[in-house]
Every structure is written in structure tokens, then in C-alpha cells.
């Protein structure tokens, strides 16, 4: 027989990594092998995620917790606790239907995952490019050509060259 | 190193009392290690005594033989789990186990102790 | 739940197969451990839900069955195999965790 203290509703009694069997008197029975109640009273024990193919076990199932998954190398995840696994892409390029595309000119994308986005535009900001974008790198805006007027540098001048051997004083 | 250890066995009179303790050290009880208590009288099989649900709650699983004479306890700060046996009868000599059930090994029993006798005896 | 198993006991030679069964009183799906216990020595665990192997036990040994029906099977008895084999429901509850009676397998 099983005993529990407490005269409340005998369900309510059964902690986590257990279920309310109805069909054995509502006893608290542990959760079989591979699955788990990751709360008390529950009614069943859910069966366990397993990760396989593509992806890979984070974290094991326990009595009171689900497995976690996440991504092969070469795959990233995507959704909410990692639903789905979607190819890594190089720096450059974006996920298409038809696998990875480098990005167009004018679009840049610095991650292995995602899509390729426009370059900044500078004058939108009143400034002018300071280096240009490529399919890795966002543009780098400087000063507005304004700042750039016969006497401004945009460059900061060398320091001053020291004499071999000297130490700063 | 992971183990269970068994004490407080000995002689002990019918109608006596002995409360026995399992140690554990290794790993903590919770809700995929249950402690369990089985025994084995000379000369013959293994016997189901019961187990207590291994985290916080008070849930224990007994066999029907044991009729409320046999209790079976828990301390966490300890990590160590009790068998308390009442109106002892010479039926109860036996080698007593401690033994860990595991969700992992489908609630087998993974892990034992070495065991601590009992005889009971006028 | 009743556990039965048989034979109580066998007589074998290494190199022999050997089957043991184990029959509950009631279903208890695949909730079914096996043990080997030697004289003097606490028991090990062989084989856990029916039929999975555990850690460290040599692929000699196999389990299978589901419900009420359960086999053991060593392939190629060897040496050390010579003991006392046991069957357990891990089905809790209800008197629900209760040994099989044991098969003693000895040298022929």
C-alpha cells in the first residue's frame, strides 16, 4: 500500500516526477523511464523530447524536467526551446530555398544566421561614408562633408615621433 | 566515491524494536533516486520492503506484508534514510539492503549497500 | 503483484544457453528488472525495462518480453555467471516492486 500525509485531495499530494494513476486508486506513481511532471497533481508525466538528427541533447530528460536541444555544428536553432534547426550560412551570405546565397550588393549580413540587410545610408544622417560596406561589414559613417571643411581632418594627427632608445617621460 | 552504507543492525528480542540507517554518499536522493529497503533471510530470496519518494515529499511505497510494522524515513540534510521495525518477530532475521531505485535504470535498483544483519532472537 | 519465475533452479555447462522466465500476476508493461546475486554479495543489476542492458553488464546477457511475460537469456554461460538470478516489477505501488522467487544456476 502507499501511504500520504495529508487529508487533502490525493492528488494534490503527488509532487513532481509523479502522476495521479487513476487506475490504482490515485496513488502518486514515479514517472516511468522517459518521461517526466515537471509540476505536483499532475494527471500523466509527458513522454520526454529526444533529440536526434540534426539535433543534439543540451540538457538530459529527468523525472521533473524535459530534455533540452540544441543544434549540430553547422545548424543553429530557431524557435521557441529550440523547435527547429536551420543551416549555418558564412558571413556573407543568407538562407535561401536554394541554400546559402552571398549577399547582393548593397546588403551585408556579419552573422551565420539571418538575412543579408542594406547597407546604413549615411547621408540619411547628414554624414558621408568613411568606410565602405561589403557583404560582411556594414558601412562606417564619419563626419558630415560639412565637418570636412579646408582646415577640419577627420584624421587624428600622428603623436610625435620619439627617439629610438628614449623612454616616455 | 557514489555508495550507500548500511547500520544499526544486531540481536534484538521478539517483540523488540530496531531502527536501521542507510547513508548515502555520492549523489543526493530526489525524484530519480528513491531510497528502498529489501531483505533477504538465510538461505533464501530477495524481499521487497518498501521505498520512500526521494525528494521532499513524504510519499512512501510499502509491500502489504509489512502490515505497518515497518516504517521508512528520510532526512535530506543527511542524506540518509531510515528503516524503523516494530513488534519484531524471528521470521524478521535477515540481511537487510539498502538499495538505490533510479529513474534512469527504469527504477531498477542501480545501487546497493553492503548490507547489515538482524536476527531476532530470545 | 506475484512475481513467478522458473525454474528455481539449473544445472549448465559454460558455453551453454540459458534461459530464465519470469511471469507478473498482473501487466506491468515493460517494467521489469533483472538481477545477479552471488553468496555473501548484494545484488547487481543486469538488465532494467525488460531489455535494456545495464552499465558495464557484458552483451552475453539479453532480457525481453512485456506484460506479464519475461525471459532472461545468457548467449554463452560463462564461469562467472555461476549464481542466483532474480526478476523485479519496478511497477509502483500497490505492492508493486516485488522480487521473483530466483533461479540458482550451478555448474553441471
Known amino acids: 500500500f502507499e501511504r500520504t500525509r495529508s487529508l487533502q485531495d490525493p492528488c494534490s499530494n503527488c509532487p513532481a516526477g509523479t502522476f495521479c494513476d487513476n487506475n490504482r486508486n490515485q496513488i502518486c506513481s514515479p514517472c516511468p523511464p522517459n518521461s517526466f511532471s515537471s509540476a505536483g497533481g499532475q494527471r500523466t508525466c509527458d513522454i520526454c523530447r529526444q533529440c536526434k538528427g540534426v539535433f543534439r541533447t543540451r540538457k538530459e530528460c529527468s523525472s521533473t524536467s524535459n530534455a533540452e536541444c540544441d543544434c549540430t555544428p553547422g545548424f543553429h536553432c530557431l524557435g521557441a526551446g529550440c523547435s527547429m534547426c536551420e543551416q549555418d550560412c558564412k558571413q556573407g551570405q543568407e538562407l535561401t530555398k536554394k541554400g546559402c546565397k552571398d549577399c547582393c550588393f548593397g546588403t551585408f549580413n556579419d552573422q551565420k544566421r539571418g538575412i543579408c540587410r542594406p547597407w546604413t545610408n549615411c547621408s540619411l544622417d547628414g554624414k558621408s561614408v568613411l568606410v565602405n560596406g561589403t557583404k560582411e561589414r556594414d558601412v562606417v559613417c564619419g563626419p558630415s562633408p560639412a565637418d570636412l571643411s579646408p582646415g577640419a581632418s577627420s584624421v587624428t594627427p600622428p603623436a610625435p615621433a620619439r627617439e629610438p632608445g628614449h623612454s616616455p617621460q | 566515491e557514489v555508495q550507500l552504507v548500511e547500520s544499526g543492525g544486531g540481536r534484538v528480542q521478539p517483540g523488540g524494536s530496531l531502527r536501521l540507517s542507510c547513508a548515502a554518499s555520492?549523489?543526493?536522493?530526489?525524484?530519480?533516486?528513491?531510497p528502498c529497503w529489501v531483505r533477504q533471510a538465510p538461505g533464501k530470496g530477495l524481499e521487497w520492503i518498501g521505498c520512500i519518494y526521494g525528494g521532499s515529499s513524504d510519499i512512501t511505497y510499502d509491500a502489504n506484508w509489512t502490515k505497518g510494522r515497518f516504517t521508512i524515513s528520510r532526512d535530506n540534510s543527511k542524506n540518509t534514510v531510515y528503516l524503523q521495525m516494530n513488534s519484531l518477530r524471528a521470521e524478521d532475521t535477515a540481511t537487510y539492503y539498502c538499495?538505490?531505485?533510479?529513474?534512469?535504470?527504469?527504477?531498477?535498483?542501480?545501487?546497493w549497500g553492503q548490507g547489515t544483519q538482524v536476527t531476532v532472537s530470545s | 503483484i506475484q512475481m513467478t519465475q522458473s525454474p528455481s533452479s539449473l544445472s549448465a555447462s559454460v558455453g551453454d544457453r540459458v534461459t530464465i522466465t519470469c511471469q507478473a500476476s498482473?501487466?506491468?508493461?515493460?517494467?521489469l528488472a533483472w538481477y545477479q546475486q552471488k553468496p555473501g554479495k548484494a545484488p547487481k543489476l543486469l538488465i532494467y525495462s525488460a531489455s535494456t542492458l545495464a552499465s558495464g553488464v557484458p552483451s552475453r546477457f539479453s532480457g525481453s518480453g512485456s506484460g506479464t511475460d519475461f525471459t532472461l537469456t545468457i548467449s554463452s554461460l560463462q564461469p562467472e555467471d555461476f549464481a542466483t538470478y532474480y526478476c523485479q516489477s519496478t511497477y509502483y505501488g500497490n505492492d508493486g516492486n516485488a522480487f521473483g522467487t530466483g533461479t540458482k544456476v550451478t555448474v553441471l
Open positions: 538499495a538505490r531505485s533510479a529513474w534512469y535504470s527504469g527504477w531498477g535498483g542501480d545501487l
Open positions: 498482473q501487466s506491468i508493461s515493460n517494467r
Open positions: 555520492g549523489f543526493s536522493f530526489s525524484a530519480n533516486y528513491y
